[in-house]
Interface confidence: low
């Protein structure tokens, strides 16, 4: 899988999109696990309703938030007063038994606050290529990974 | 093989600076977020500042912001720490250590390479 | 900011011996969580990240456990080179990063 790149402000929401086909993952539950390293496991952090027919209700742990348009075959991850520790790899899933198919493997990355100027020296600002003008909107802005471009480099 | 190196401690009047390296090789520094861990003298660890893997993101601890700088260079893989109006208390061993995770700065992985250390003394 | 509280903070034991360190978090850290060993004079080594993934290169007579609040390292078979300093760390919340205050493994 490619690494999708979803950047968010801190502070704010991110919203994370995950498309996938909806016939091929009929009746399977979905999750959003974060990856612990290069090579250890992908740790869950939420999953949809117990119930497949109840995926569209929002489920959340702490602040995250999980839920499915298993018609539309797109899953979304909302995660809430987004922080510096919130970055990292994560994985979309689709649920089968004991196994977890990859849907999109996503990077988050957490951009400084452009309004908090608490250390103004030290804040990079987004470029203008990305909007961030109203402070209360779920900003996502998402990329693709380069094939060259890995989120977790080969152990040295 | 994966190393830091550490350098530019010393002993320094309380209210002057004093800036330290960190030189790194054996890894793709480039990738990683980056760390300063201090230690006083008989005392615990104490982690100082961290920078995202492309210097876009910096965070200290409360006992530093306003006085210390941590940045870096990719180009010349090494890592900074300005220290200015150095205070007694900022006596101690400093290491520079790299974060595990890797591409977007620390996050919730811990430390897997850390230098030798170089003591910084703030004495009149 | 997140307090981590290990114990004990010394511990005698023999070569051979089960020795278990705990750290308690003030807040539910999930599985956030790294131990460390450090010897005197020389930098810390990273021994256990996410509370329970060995790294590399670390012998398995160490392990991790524990999730939320409640972590425990433990040597399963005492060797004469553990004998050192252990922390723990969390770096899910942060700034700042905390380490624990540190628990000495001394001869007995």
């Known amino acids: 899988h490619n690494t999708t790149v979803f950047q968010g402000v801190a502070g704010q929401s991110l919203q994370v999109s995950c498309p996938y086909d909806s016939m091929k993952h009929w009746g399977r539950r979905k999750a959003w696990c974060r990856q612990l390293g290069e090579k250890g496991p992908c740790q869950r952090v939420v999953s949809t309703h117990n119930l497949w027919l109840l995926s569209f209700l929002r489920r959340w742990n702490g602040s995250t938030a999980i839920t499915d348009d298993t018609l539309g075959g797109t899953l979304t991850i909302t995660l809430r007063n987004l922080q510096p520790h919130d970055a990292g790899l994560y994985q979309c899933q689709s649920l089968h038994g004991s196994e977890a198919d990859t849907l999109r493997k996503v990077l988050v990355e957490v951009l400084a606050d452009p309004l908090d100027h608490r250390d103004a020296g030290d804040l990079w600002f987004p470029g203008e290529s990305e909007s961030f003008e109203d402070a209360h909107v779920e900003h996502s802005i998402s990329r693709s990974l380069l094939e060259g471009e890995i989120p977790f480099p080969p152990t040295s | 093989q994966v190393q830091l190196v550490e350098s530019g401690g010393g002993v320094v009047q309380p209210g002057r600076s004093l800036r330290l390296s960190c030189a790194a090789s054996g890894f793709t520094f480039s990738s990683y977020g980056m760390h300063w861990v201090r230690q006083a003298p008989g005392k615990g660890l104490e982690w100082v500042a961290v920078i995202w893997y492309d210097g876009s993101n910096k965070y200290y601890a409360d006992s530093v912001k306003g006085r210390f700088t941590i940045s870096r260079d990719n180009s010349k893989n090494t890592l900074y720490l300005q220290m200015n109006s150095l205070r007694a208390e900022d006596t101690a061993v400093y290491y520079c250590?790299?974060?595990?995770?890797?591409?977007?700065?620390?996050?919730?992985?811990?430390?897997?390479?850390w230098g030798q250390g170089t003591t910084v003394t703030v004495s009149s | 900011d997140i307090q981590l509280t290990q114990s004990p903070s010394s511990v005698s034991a023999s070569v051979g011996d089960r020795v278990t360190i705990t750290c308690r978090a003030s807040?539910?850290?999930?599985?956030?969580l790294a131990w460390y060993q450090q010897k005197p004079g020389k930098a810390p080594k990273l021994l256990i990240y996410?509370?329970?993934s060995l790294q590399s290169g670390v012998p398995s007579r160490f392990s991790g456990s524990g999730s939320g609040t409640d972590f425990t390292l433990t040597i399963s078979s005492l060797q004469p080179e553990d004998f050192a300093t252990y922390y723990c760390q969390q770096e899910v919340d942060y700034p700042p990063l905390t380490f624990g205050g540190g628990t000495k493994v001394e001869i007995k």
């Open positions: 807040q539910d850290i999930s599985s956030w």
């Open positions: 250590a790299k974060d595990l995770g890797g591409y977007y700065g620390g996050a919730a992985y811990g430390m897997d390479v």
């Open positions: 996410a509370a329970s």
